[in-house]
């Protein structure tokens, strides 16, 4: 049960999270003007991977596409990359988690797969979730590092005579929202994974049984130690159990005709 | 059709206050900046109070911040112009306008007059 | 407050003459996220309220003669009417909508002859 309910959160988290990088992708407000400390302009700047707008104090919104694919700066290029890498990754992810998912029955398909797929829906999210991670972070150093250069020469004018107010941005809700949306896919990753060592049917551990050769009798104690990578790569000589969802101990605890020879 | 009608104006005196209303149609009045601005009889414009559009921000100029407040009833369609301590220099016509693209005003009434004088 | 000068003070001009008036602020309306100028201009004519003319610097509103246009970015603005009429006369404001608070220049009074 226990397993079920891991798997069934994992997969619930890692959707919200997916969700999230999508919106976040979307979004708009990756970077926002900053407004403390400048003088009180009635439009309102802000961008996103794909177009820049402007908000009017007068309502009017007007946004205009980047529609150019040579002309935008290499970091915004490999943020883009880096979120749709995730976006893929994570929806690959889903789609698979959903028929690991112990729940729902699919023909006759073995503890075992539905073990391997888990591990591999849960890996994606874990990649998914650190790309989306990634592509924020860089963003938001690119945002910082232009935030301090742009300080640095605020104003700009000919002579002092003139000055043009420098717009300055800062971290947008896009950023927020995808930290958050990554470290949640991240996290349900995490969870599918625990979940897959449940899932994987162990080595069947043997009771002690004594064998009674002609000269002197000696215990031989076949499987008697566990399978140390608990993904259930080795499937040969294991038991099958029918009995609905178990953890390892109880699968274990349950002795079987199989048990004694 | 945008339609914008000013009310309120009149005769006060120094140190008095008075209360404008603008009966906005035509518009999802909310969405849209809206401004007063006074002509003086030099015929001078000054735009003496700004509310923006959506998030509903006020803004003044020096000449009339802590006297002048602007606000707006959504479910009448109603913009106010609350003015309060009035000097013989608020003396002016003063007119609604609602703003749009570039912030400018397309749209006017026809002004009331308010004249401060003892 | 942002100051807007505005120059010449009066016009006097013929009929199918081409007039140019300036207008010049104290700090760049040009704003870089999307490259417009805030910069607007009026047209005023005796006893109505003003009438939108140009917006953004140099798009012309709707309903307003091609003879009009409106050029100039960052802190100097030009309003030109390539053939004046007689129905031209009238008081020209150029406003700052880009700083609060939004602020009108003095006016040009254009005389028809």
């Known amino acids: 049960m226990a397993v079920t309910a891991c798997q069934g959160l994992g997969f619930v988290v890692s959707l919200i999270g997916i969700a999230g990088i999508i919106a976040a992708t979307c979004m708009d407000q990756w970077s926002t003007q900053d407004l403390y400390n400048n003088p009180v302009t009635a439009v309102f700047n802000y961008q996103g991977l794909w177009r820049s707008c402007v908000r009017e104090s007068s309502g009017f919104t007007e946004c205009r596409g980047y529609f150019t694919l040579l002309g935008l700066p290499a970091m915004l290029q490999a943020v883009r990359a880096l979120m749709i890498v995730g976006i893929v990754l994570g929806a690959i992810g889903l789609l698979v988690s959903i028929f690991a998912l112990k729940c729902i029955r699919i023909g006759s398909m073995e503890d075992s797969a539905k073990a391997n797929m888990t591990l591999t829906s849960g890996i994606m999210f874990i990649v998914s979730g650190l790309c989306a991670i990634a592509g924020v972070s860089v963003f938001a150093n690119m945002l910082v590092t232009n935030f301090w250069m742009s300080t640095a020469n605020m104003y700009t004018g000919m002579g002092g005579m003139v000055q043009t107010v420098q717009t300055r941005y800062t971290f947008g809700a896009a950023l927020f929202v995808g930290w958050v949306a990554g470290g949640l896919t991240l996290i349900g990753g995490v969870m599918m994974c625990i979940a897959c060592r449940g899932l994987a049917p162990e080595e069947t551990n043997y009771k002690a049984v004594s064998y009674h050769a002609s000269g002197h009798s000696v215990a031989y104690k076949p499987g008697g130690f566990k399978a140390s990578t608990g993904f259930g790569s080795n499937t040969k000589n294991k038991k099958i159990y029918d009995g609905g969802a178990r953890t390892e101990d109880e699968v274990q605890s349950y002795p079987s005709k199989h048990d004694y020879v | 059709e945008v339609k914008l009608v000013e009310s309120g104006g009149g005769l006060v005196k120094p140190g008095g206050s008075l209360k404008l209303s603008c009966a906005a149609s035509g518009f999802t009045f909310s969405s849209y900046g809206m401004s007063w601005v006074r002509q003086t009889p030099e015929k001078r414009l000054e735009c003496v109070a700004t509310i923006s559009g959506g998030d509903s921000y006020t803004y003044y100029p020096d000449s009339v911040r802590g006297r002048f407040t602007i606000s707006r009833d959504i479910a009448k369609n109603n913009l106010y112009l609350q003015m309060s301590s009035l000097r013989s220099e608020d003396t002016a016509l003063y007119y609604c306008a609602r703003s749009y693209n570039g912030n400018s005003l397309p749209y006017w009434g026809q002004g009331t007059l308010v004249t401060v004088s003892s | 407050d942002i100051v807007m000068t505005q120059y010449p003070s009066f016009l006097t001009v013929t009929t199918g003459e081409k007039v140019t008036m300036s207008c010049k602020s104290s700090?760049?309306?040009?704003?870089?996220?999307?490259?417009?100028?805030?910069l607007t201009w009026y047209q005023q004519k005796p006893g109505q309220p003003p009438k939108l003319l140009i917006y953004w610097a140099s798009t012309r509103e709707s309903g307003v003669p091609d003879r009009f246009a409106g050029s100039g970015s960052g802190t100097d603005f030009t309003l030109t009417i390539s053939s004046v009429q007689a129905e031209d006369l009238a008081i020209y404001y150029c406003?700052?909508?880009?700083?609060?608070?939004?602020?009108f220049g003095s006016g040009t009074k254009l005389e028809v002859k």
């Open positions: 700090q760049s309306l040009l704003n870089s996220g999307n490259q417009r100028n805030y």
């Open positions: 406003q700052n909508n880009y700083f609060y608070p939004f602020t």
